[in-house]
Interface confidence: medium
């Protein structure tokens, strides 16, 4: 999906109002120094592409994030403020079911959510720069 035509201001407002709180709740009890941020993004559409990927695509060591509250709110926000987003996601979900390879090892969900927080902060920063 091409996030170029999203209403970035509205997405930022939704993030600051609810999604950020849910992400922080998920991370509560962990220190910001526990994990290094290795994922970055360069502009608003790129940030949203990375956010979508980390939130909804099961990774080898974290498969459950898509059912968390912050993910549900992220999905609703993108569907609301990115034209045509909902339709593209239905096909993507079907295609993904067979494709992924998971690995039974160490749980990395907290690390992944830490990366997500970093991506969202980057999204807000790039938005402020544009303004």
């Amino acid at each position: 999906y091409d996030f170029t035509n999203c209403d970035f201001q509205k997405i930022e407002a939704d993030y600051l109002r609810t999604i950020s709180k849910d992400l922080i709740t998920y991370m509560s009890g962990t220190k910001s120094t526990d994990f290094n941020n290795t994922v970055s993004c360069s502009n608003r559409p790129h940030c949203l592409t990375e956010i979508q990927s980390l939130t909804f695509n099961p990774t080898p060591r974290c498969a459950s994030l898509a059912k968390e509250m912050f993910a549900r709110k992220t999905k609703a926000t993108l569907a609301l403020w990115c034209p045509g987003y909902s339709e593209t996601q239905i096909n993507a979900t079907q295609a993904m079911k067979k494709r992924r390879k998971r690995k039974v090892t160490t749980n990395k969900c907290l690390e992944q959510v830490s990366q997500l927080l970093g991506l969202w902060r980057r999204f807000i920063r790039t938005l402020l720069k544009q303004q």
Epitope: T30, C62, K97, K98, R102, V104, T105, T106, N107
Partner: antibody
Framework: QVQLVQSGAEVKKPGSSVKVSCKAS????????IHWVRQAPGQGLEWMGI????????SLNQKFQGRVTITADESTSTAYMELSSLRSEDTAVYYC??????????WGQGTLVTVSS | DIQMTQSPSSLSASVGDRVTITCRAS??????LAWYQQKPGKAPKLLIY???TLPEGVPSRFSGSGSGTDFTLTISSLQPEDFATYYC?????????FGQGTKVEIK
């Protein structure tokens, strides 16, 4: 709704094998791992092993390595756990459970396996 | 393997009491801790995961806290249906292991 339905109780002789089935319904079988956990009478819970039904990748508790085989049949949405060389201390309730990241949101009803001569 | 140690192993309480059960991991498991409730003859039921997240349908009187190695399950006001055995379990890395259980009995 999500259901994991296990096969019935078994009585086995020492040295023999038992195969317990776990039929899943109400969700996409290949999207979740199936774990096997056992509980001896009056005791706690013990993780035995796991299977990814999408490709039959397994990981087993070292304690059961060589004695336990976990398989899955995607066409029938059924997972199986076979335990061989049974001894009296294997008498337990065997549970299958569904998981994405190591915690179990749905469990089978349990299968009592009694090992007795 | 990561060892999980629960305390107490049993406790007696009355309806309406606040009950606290603790679980200690032998090494850092961050917030990867789940709590289960089990009644006699039944399969365990998930109460909490990620140390503090309640799945849908679990009453809000149950709460979890802690991270690293020390965790707590709290029942704010014990109800008749809460008399059961409670287990903690880490979901950090294989092999996943459980605490030995805490039996909550009627005083």
């Amino acid at each position: 709704q999500v259901q994991l339905v296990q096969s019935g109780a078994e009585v086995k002789k020492p040295g023999s094998s038992v195969k317990v089935s776990c039929k899943a319904s109400g969700y996409s079988f290949i999207s979740y791992w199936i774990h096997w956990v056992r509980q001896a009478p009056g005791q706690g819970l013990e993780w035995m092993g796991i299977i990814d039904p999408s490709d039959s990748d397994t990981s087993l508790n070292q304690k059961f390595q060589g004695r336990v085989t976990i398989t899955a049949d995607e066409s029938t949405s059924t997972a199986y756990m076979e335990l061989s060389s049974l001894r009296s201390e294997d008498t337990a309730v065997y549970y299958c459970a569904r998981s994405l990241d190591g915690y179990y949101d749905y469990w089978g009803q349990g299968t009592l396996v009694t090992v007795s001569s | 393997d990561i060892q999980m140690t629960q305390s107490p192993s049993s406790l007696s309480a009355s309806v309406g009491d606040r009950v606290t059960i603790t679980c200690r991991a032998s090494e850092n498991i961050y917030s990867y801790l789940a709590w289960y409730q089990q009644k006699p003859g039944k399969a365990p039921k998930l109460l909490i995961y990620n140390a503090r997240t309640l799945p849908e349908g679990v009453p809000s009187r149950f709460s979890g806290s802690g991270s690293g190695t020390d965790f707590t399950l709290t029942i704010s006001s014990l109800q008749p249906e809460d008399f059961a055995t409670y287990y903690c379990q880490h979901h950090y890395t294989t092999p996943w292991t459980f605490g030995q259980g805490t039996k909550v009995e009627i005083k």
